[in-house]
């Protein structure tokens, strides 16, 4: 029978003729830094290549014996969930293993960087086709860590890594803060957050989505036709390790923006239960667990995005975040969301020669985070049209007014303290789909692109009681790129897009009272590319 | 940079009382930061990341790498560089005393100093 | 799904011996420890004895010490009890039973975290009597 | 060894009742603990492992607490296929003992 795990990222619209990409990864070379391998078990063996690359420390105390499988138990059981012939994800892909982790499973920073100066090196000497590069290890926050990580993932490799197992914020350890690398939180049979011990998964808005990470069936190094159960992030980030090889093999040209959109893509949506996350995390933790795509063809022609959410401001009264996309990304939108519901929005802005997406604490306001819409737009021309507070009543309003350039969304900013308490609720004219609209005292911004085949449309929720959350999905064949609530409604948190649904979120409504301003209108807007849907034709 | 400091191996013996001084400070005013983890356990002081700036030729990260033991020398510090990089981050890892981070962050071309620290299988 | 079938029971004198076998499908056998479990007619369940996935580590329940023993073959995904001088008081259903469980790494350390017992046979009946 | 007492050792019930089923441990197993239903002439089967947490496919009737020394199996609500016998499990370094198990029955 197939472990569930493998069955859990097998997709559900199963076709044997079209289900795995040519010998499953053969085109892919995946680096593992990890523990010493046991490279002639049945299920690794001829496929993973042992470098010479050794830098460890000492294991730790008097009492530690060095025994051969324990040296090797961790590494081996990773080699085997990537490639393994039996239990393996991508079971035609190629493996180099670099020793960074002792027998105790323990390593340090500056070793690992050495590793990954050593497959740099490797690479600049011998280019290979596709590199993916599994950190199956985690340790406190590092700034040069993260800083190598950015560097070899800006060389066109793909890195991915464990989220760590300490129940935790995955912001506060590296490698998996890192921006560049594809983080993975781990799940069990269940769909539920893995618990490790008194532990457990990472989480928060460092991770990219989870993967199978318990009860893992795998290449166990006490014989070498043994098999074991191991548990971990470490596995979980194994399996998109995998996943990664053999869509990569499949489409050996795609960009690690690309490779990252397609994961989140073709994730299971909205599977995992929130509850074991602590309250304050649940809505920067992504609810995606990873799977193979259902077929090696008819990705191309779809308008990826995702949501990327800012680090938290901090409290001070002109604090602000900022949330940025990967470099290949277009940001499409831009949102806010604070807690305590004080915040003075959130506008685009050039930092760098790129838009960013800023958001901005008020006055007596816990802090804020900046919600970032980021999306895959080939040859994109985007820029931001403000239009400052209005003098009229009508409110502020702004449109795109270039030839052939389309809204992608809506922010709005304010410098007064807590706008709309006292205001009736301003209502956008009908008929008018291609502008943005917000109070007289706020500026406004609209994202105004031009992109082949480009088309958008605005589609609204509005819900005339209180009530906690308005959500508006675009159907499919649509992406969402832009997600705000409708001006007028004082007691609105933010907005924020998770996968195709606009979400606003409003203050407890027993905190409000049902007035006329209870009213929650969600707008979002949804795009579609006919570019990239004919060009994908013209491929097939 | 052209390195000023000479002959290494002969400066622990010929000392000048100018060259006593710190390290030149660094490029453009910017003053290097130090890091470390804010996990206690996981920290191992004693050894440090020198990173340099980005465009740090890899004989200027020599360079440093051999002014820093010369100026701990002359304070009387032993150091030892355990790797010079280059490839994907110029910069150097050195075991030394913590005692001269104040000396290393002076030095020039350096952007920051990070203090060694474990990573743990997942 | 994995299933197990265990074999061998049957009548034996005091002082007799008896092999048990246990055949199970897939990987998912060779990756777990193994239990043998009895109940006596009317009586509890007494756990017996218990075996690694490579066989290395073995363990048993006093009253058996020294007269039972527990092996595996990964080769023919099977698990055995060889019970030596046996008593009127080991008359049981005899199950063999996987012990789920995993291990995982945390701050250097390897743990074991265990499930129970998730999957049994349908056990065979050992009888000893003169 | 570690001893197990389960009590009571006969339960009578009738479905939709709420019921709970003890067992104490000599000595402290932390959170090592595993719950088992059987049937006349069958083989147990697992319903709680690691004090608290269900096992697949088991009713969410079905819930566990405790650690240390004391546990409980709880079911909320009675059903016609809930009357078995029910045993506890300690593991504690890879040897094992059941309790003597608690007998449900219809009241």
């Known amino acids: 029978s197939i472990p569930w795990n493998l069955e859990r990222i097998t997709p559900p619209r199963y076709r044997a003729d079209e289900y795995q990409p040519p010998d499953g990864g053969s085109l892919v070379e995946v680096y593992l830094l990890d523990t010493s391998i046991q490279s002639d078990h049945r299920e690794i063996e001829g496929r993973v290549m042992v470098t010479d690359f050794e830098n460890v420390p000492e294991e730790d105390g008097t009492r530690f014996h060095r025994q051969a499988s324990k040296c090797d138990s961790h590494g081996t059981h990773l080699a085997g969930v990537v490639s393994g012939r039996d239990a393996g994800v991508a079971k035609g892909a190629s493996m180099r293993s670099l020793r960074v982790l002792n027998c105790q499973g323990k390593g340090t920073v500056s070793g690992t960087l050495i590793g990954l100066e050593f497959i740099r090196k490797s690479q600049l000497v011998q280019p290979v086709g596709p590199l993916v590069v599994l950190l199956p290890l985690a340790g406190g926050y590092s700034r040069v860590l993260n800083a190598a990580c950015q560097r070899l993932a800006r060389a066109g490799v793909v890195l991915v890594t464990a989220a760590g197992n300490f129940r935790d914020d995955a912001c506060l350890y590296s490698p998996a803060s890192a921006p560049e690398v594809i983080t993975v939180g781990a799940t069990n049979a269940q769909d539920q957050p893995v618990t490790l011990g008194t532990l457990g998964t990472n989480f928060g808005r460092c991770v990219d989505l989870f993967a199978p990470g318990e009860d893992i069936i795998g290449a166990s190094s006490d014989c070498s036709t043994c098999f074991v159960s191991q548990s971990g992030t470490s596995q979980a980030a194994a399996h998109v390790a995998g996943i990664a090889a053999m869509m990569l093999s499949a489409e050996p040209e795609l960009t690690l923006a690309e490779l990252r959109q397609r994961l989140i893509h073709f994730s299971a949506k909205d599977v995992i239960n929130e509850a074991w996350f602590p309250e304050d995390q649940r809505v920067l933790t992504p609810n995606l667990v990873a799977a193979l795509p259902p077929s090696t063809h008819g990705a191309g022609w779809q308008l990826f995005c995702r949501t990327v959410w800012s680090a938290h401001s901090g409290p001070t009264r002109m604090a602000t975040a900022v949330a940025r996309c990967a470099p290949d990304e277009e940001l499409l939108s831009c949102s806010s969301f604070s807690r305590s519901g004080k915040r003075r929005g959130e506008r685009m802005e050039a930092q760098g020669g790129k838009l960013v997406c800023r958001a901005h604490n008020a006055f007596g306001g816990e802090g804020v985070y900046a919600i970032a819409r980021c999306c895959l737009l080939p040859q994109a021309n985007c820029s931001v049209h403000t239009a400052p507070p209005a003098e009229a009543s009508m409110g502020t309003r702004v449109h795109c007014h270039q030839q052939g350039h389309v809204l992608t969304g809506c922010s709005s900013h304010w410098e007064v303290e807590d706008l709309g308490t006292h205001k009736p609720p301003v209502l956008r004219p009908r008929g008018q789909p291609n502008q943005c609209v917000g109070h007289r005292e706020a500026s406004i911004h609209a994202s105004c692109c031009h992109a082949p085949g480009l088309e958008c449309k605005v589609k609204e929720h509005g819900i005339p009681a209180p009530q906690e959350q308005v959500t508006v999905a675009c159907e499919e064949g649509w992406t969402l790129t832009g997600c705000s609530a409708l001006p007028g409604t004082s007691h609105v948190l933010g907005a924020y897009a998770v996968d195709n649904t606009c979400v606003v979120r409003s203050r407890d409504v027993s905190t409000t009272g049902s007035t006329s301003e209870g009213a929650v209108t969600a707008v979002a807007i949804c795009c579609r590319s006919r570019h990239l849907a004919q060009a994908s034709q013209e491929l097939q | 940079q052209e390195d000023e400091d000479g002959d290494y191996e002969e400066l622990v013996l010929a000392l000048r009382s100018e060259e006593d001084g710190l390290a030149e400070a660094p490029e453009h005013g910017t003053t290097a930061t130090f890091h470390r983890c804010a996990k206690d356990p996981w920290r191992l002081p004693g050894t440090y990341v020198v990173v340099l700036k980005e465009e740090t030729h890899l004989s200027q990260s020599e360079r440093t790498a051999r002014r820093l033991q010369a100026q701990a020398a002359r304070r009387g510090y032993l150091t030892k560089i355990l790797h010079v990089f280059h490839g994907l981050l110029p910069g150097f890892l050195v075991k030394m005393s913590g005692d001269l981070l104040e000396l290393a962050l002076k030095l020039p071309h350096v952007d920051y100093i990070e203090e060694d620290s474990s990573v743990f299988a997942q | 799904e994995v299933q197990l079938v265990e074999s061998g029971g049957g009548l034996v004198q005091p002082g007799g011996s008896l092999r048990l076998s246990c055949a199970a499908s897939?990987?998912?056998?060779?990756?777990?420890?193994m239990s043998w479990v009895r109940q006596a007619p009317g009586k509890g369940l007494e756990w017996v004895a218990n075996?690694?996935?490579?066989?290395?580590?073995?363990y048993y329940v006093d009253s058996v010490k020294g007269r039972f023993t527990i092996s595996r073959d990964i080769a023919k995904n099977s698990l055995y009890l060889q019970m030596n001088s046996l008593r009127a008081e080991d008359t049981a259903v005899y199950y063999c039973?996987?012990?789920?469980?995993?291990?995982?790494?945390?701050?250097?350390?390897?743990?074991?975290?265990?499930?129970?017992?998730?999957?049994w046979g349908q056990g065979t009946t050992v009888t000893v009597s003169s | 060894d570690i001893q197990m007492t389960q009590s009571p050792s006969t339960l009578s019930a009738s479905v939709g009742d709420r019921v709970t089923i003890t067992c104490r441990a000599s000595?402290?197993?932390?959170?090592?603990l595993a719950w088992y239903q059987q049937k006349p002439g069958k083989a147990p089967k697992l319903l709680i492992y690691?004090?608290?947490s269900l096992e697949s496919g088991v009713p969410s009737r079905f819930s566990g607490s405790g650690s240390g020394t004391e546990f409980t199996l709880t079911i909320s609500s009675l059903q016609p296929d809930d009357f078995a016998t029910y045993y506890c499990?300690?593991?504690?370094?890879?040897?094992?003992?059941f309790g003597q198990g608690t007998k449900l029955e219809i009241k």
């Open positions: 039973a996987r012990d789920r469980g995993t291990y995982y790494y945390q701050e250097g350390s390897y743990n074991y975290y265990y499930y129970g017992m998730d999957v």
């Open positions: 897939g990987i998912t056998f060779s990756s777990y420890w």
């Open positions: 075996i690694k996935q490579d066989g290395s580590e073995k």
């Open positions: 000595q402290s197993i932390s959170s090592w």
């Open positions: 690691k004090a608290s």
């Open positions: 499990q300690q593991y504690n370094s890879y040897s094992y003992t």
